[in-house]
Interface confidence: low
Amino acid sequence: FEIALPRESNITVLIKLGTPTLLAKPCYIVISKRHITMLSIKSGERIVFTFSCQSPENHFVIEIQKNIDCMSGPCPFGEVQLQPSTSLLPTLNRTFIWDVKAHKSIGLELQFSIPRLRQIGPGESCPDGVTHSISGRIDATVVRIGTFCSNGTVSRIKMQEGVKMALHLPWFHPRNVSGFSIANRSSIKRLCIIESVFEGEGSATLMSANYPEGFPEDELMTWQFVVPAHLRASVSFLNFNLSNCERKEERVEYYIPGSTTNPEVFKLEDKQPGNMAGNFNLSLQGCDQDAQSPGILRLQFQVLVQHPQNESNKIYVVDLSNERAMSLTIEPRPVKQSRKFVPGCFVCLESRTCSSNLTLTSGSKHKISFLCDDLTRLWMNVEKTISCTDHRYCQRKSYSLQVPSDILHLPVELHDFSWKLLVPKDRLSLVLVPAQKLQQHTHEKPCNTSFSYLVASAIPSQDLYFGSFCPGGSIKQIQVKQNISVTLRTFAPSFQQEASRQGLTVSFIPYFKEEGVFTVTPDTKSKVYLRTPNWDRGLPSLTSVSWNISVPRDQVACLTFFKERSGVVCQTGRAFMIIQEQRTRAEEIFSLDEDVLPKPSFHHHSFWVNISNCSPTSGKQLDLLFSVTLTPRTVDLT
């Protein structure tokens, strides 16, 4: 055999006796007729030798060490070569060692081409005999990062200050490439970072540095896991020991991209998180140990990546192919953050693209599934626009404002379904007619149904909220002058059962000038509470609204206002209220910015209440609450 090492190659080859065997006949390296048991070849040397036996692999091993100095000059980064080539070496068990020394401020990254690496614990061996032993250093101390076989998940290992990589190849192994490259990185400010990539289901067992011995004092080690979004990862600790801490606390920290509570801190004895969707990092942080009785910190853990269970295997079809101008968003409902780890919750399109929120648009059929431990963490918001561009075509046309059944069948709670109703300016107005008469939500008589309709102006410059209305009241219809949004908002999961109670029809009607007209047909059984739009903020300037209140022939209506004065102070114009009997047209006019509000009044026939605002001074707004109560007539006054 001839081994020639180029000058400046910084390579040393050592052939030495391996583990002694019980073979009777000894074997020697023969060089210049001398018989030796160890041969060292340095850079720039050329040596010819043979062996005195036919099976030297049973006696000798060869170590090829290359020192790479990144302290004094540039580093030879890139793919690492096997030098000398394995074909030039005797067929012995061989270990290639690369010893890279670098500044503390420089990060070094080992990148492993496929197949990636699998870490093994003490006493384990690799099936093909090929092992990778990786160590780093802290000052002068060598730290074992771990021993690895092929066919695993570890794709990159980042260290700083230096790295020693030993690749052990059995004599019969044909491998002639190192299988890794070295790159420089910025400082990682910790002992090492191990990246583990899962491309499908699988598991990985990983260990803290120096395992089963103690993890270096007060050090930090991070594992980065790359997991496809449609799979779930769970962490379980197989074995750990805690040292005796003098300062700080030994802990593991999870960092989950996109989480609002990073980092999630766990004690080693805690139950570790499961059902994580997508990528995450896990870090082990040591402490300052007691000098007298340090103990040891060590950790062996398993990451299991698998398809999620239960709900995630179901595919839901959302057919929006016959819909127009509609979008459906599934997103996380706002929650108060807690320190507790919260597994990911994802919605997937075609089971492939998974994200924490998803918007589906009209015109297509969508297949979705869920990756979520608890679907109550998600909700749906839907927007649909119904617009009329040609008043000649739309007039008297009606549309049903109903939540499509496809949406109701999804396993996620509907939060809002908003209809934006758009009309040509000054040409048409809108009327909303509910399937069941509506009650206006007030503090005095709040809605307690599982859903309400929130009606508001949809004109960007206009801050006008008509109110919140739920089924089971006395409001027969609501007429509005111009563009509005009607939002069905659910308040309880029982909406699914009560969905049949929803039902609102919108019709395009000839234009009228008032902002809104409420048609009220009170029932004899209850008191109807009504309040002006924009409650709490005040009726907008120069806005006029009316209530058309029906009084049955055999009843009398008592109209009651809930404060003595309106409280409005006008900057310009006048605020007034007109109460007009519909039969006789007799009317009373009240100046709201001056007069006291009327005392309770009795009406034997249907009547109008019209309230018109001035331009109020800020802070002195117009808010009125009134009630209508029917009682049977005792005397016929017709």
Epitope: R247, K248, D288, R339
Partner: antibody
């Protein structure tokens, strides 16, 4: 982006009360605790205490027990500091700052409110 | 309560020089120490958390070190905009306390 917007300067007489506000935007108020820090003219920073924005429970440093009250209105993302029976030594800039009860560094601060107490 | 003592009270340097600010705690506080910068008329700004952890958006010339009771804030090469008052803060236990501040001024 995260912002803490504090109310404007106040000039008060000894014995009066003042209520300072701090409006949180760009994040959910209840996700982080709110801390109050005082800085007297030409002096350093002094931590007054904090309020748990989830539960509304306040914690006061010893020097700020009694006349100082932290409160919240989560519906409008507001934190408040009320000081009663003002004294001239309460003259200072008062800062609200965002922290976490278990991660107590203050990553965002309000611009401060100067309270001047003078007869 | 934890008393934090900062030194020096004033540090006079020229731009480009290295600044070393010290903060000593009256008892061991592990790494529960944060550093803030305050310019005249402005709110404090978080520079370093947990003794040595950098904050995104803060220039890399600011670094922190120390654990236990002795801590250091280092500005590797002072820039004109770095002249300000620097405070350390203990977050070890209630009440949280601040040091009295170190004023970094132009020489």
């Amino acid at each position: 982006q995260v912002q803490l917007q504090q109310s404007g300067s106040e000039l008060k007489k000894p014995g009066e009360s003042v209520k300072l506000s701090c409006k949180a935007s760009g994040y959910t108020l209840t996700d982080f605790s709110m801390h109050w820090v005082r800085q007297a003219p030409g002096q350093g920073l002094k931590w007054m205490g904090w309020i748990n924005t989830e539960t509304g429970a306040p914690t006061y440093a010893d020097d700020f027990k009694g006349r100082f009250v932290f409160s919240l209105d989560t519906s409008v993302s507001m934190a408040y500091l009320q000081i009663s029976s003002l004294k001239s030594e309460d003259t200072a800039v008062y800062y609200c700052s965002r922290g976490r009860d278990y991660d107590p560094h203050f990553d965002y601060w309000g611009q401060g409110t100067l309270v001047t107490v003078s007869s | 309560e934890i008393v934090l003592t900062q030194s020096p009270a004033t540090l006079s340097l020229s731009p480009g020089e290295r600044a070393t600010l010290s903060c000593r705690a009256s008892q061991s506080i592990s790494d529960f120490l944060h550093w803030y910068q305050q310019k005249p008329g402005q709110s404090p700004r978080l520079l370093i958390k947990y003794a040595s952890q950098s904050i995104s958006g803060i220039p890399a010339r600011f670094s922190g070190s120390g654990s236990g009771s002795d801590f250091t804030l280092t500005i590797s090469s002072v820039e004109p905009e770095d002249f300000a008052v620097y405070y350390c803060q203990s977050a070890h236990s209630f009440p949280y306390t601040f040091g009295q501040g170190t004023k970094l001024e132009i020489k």
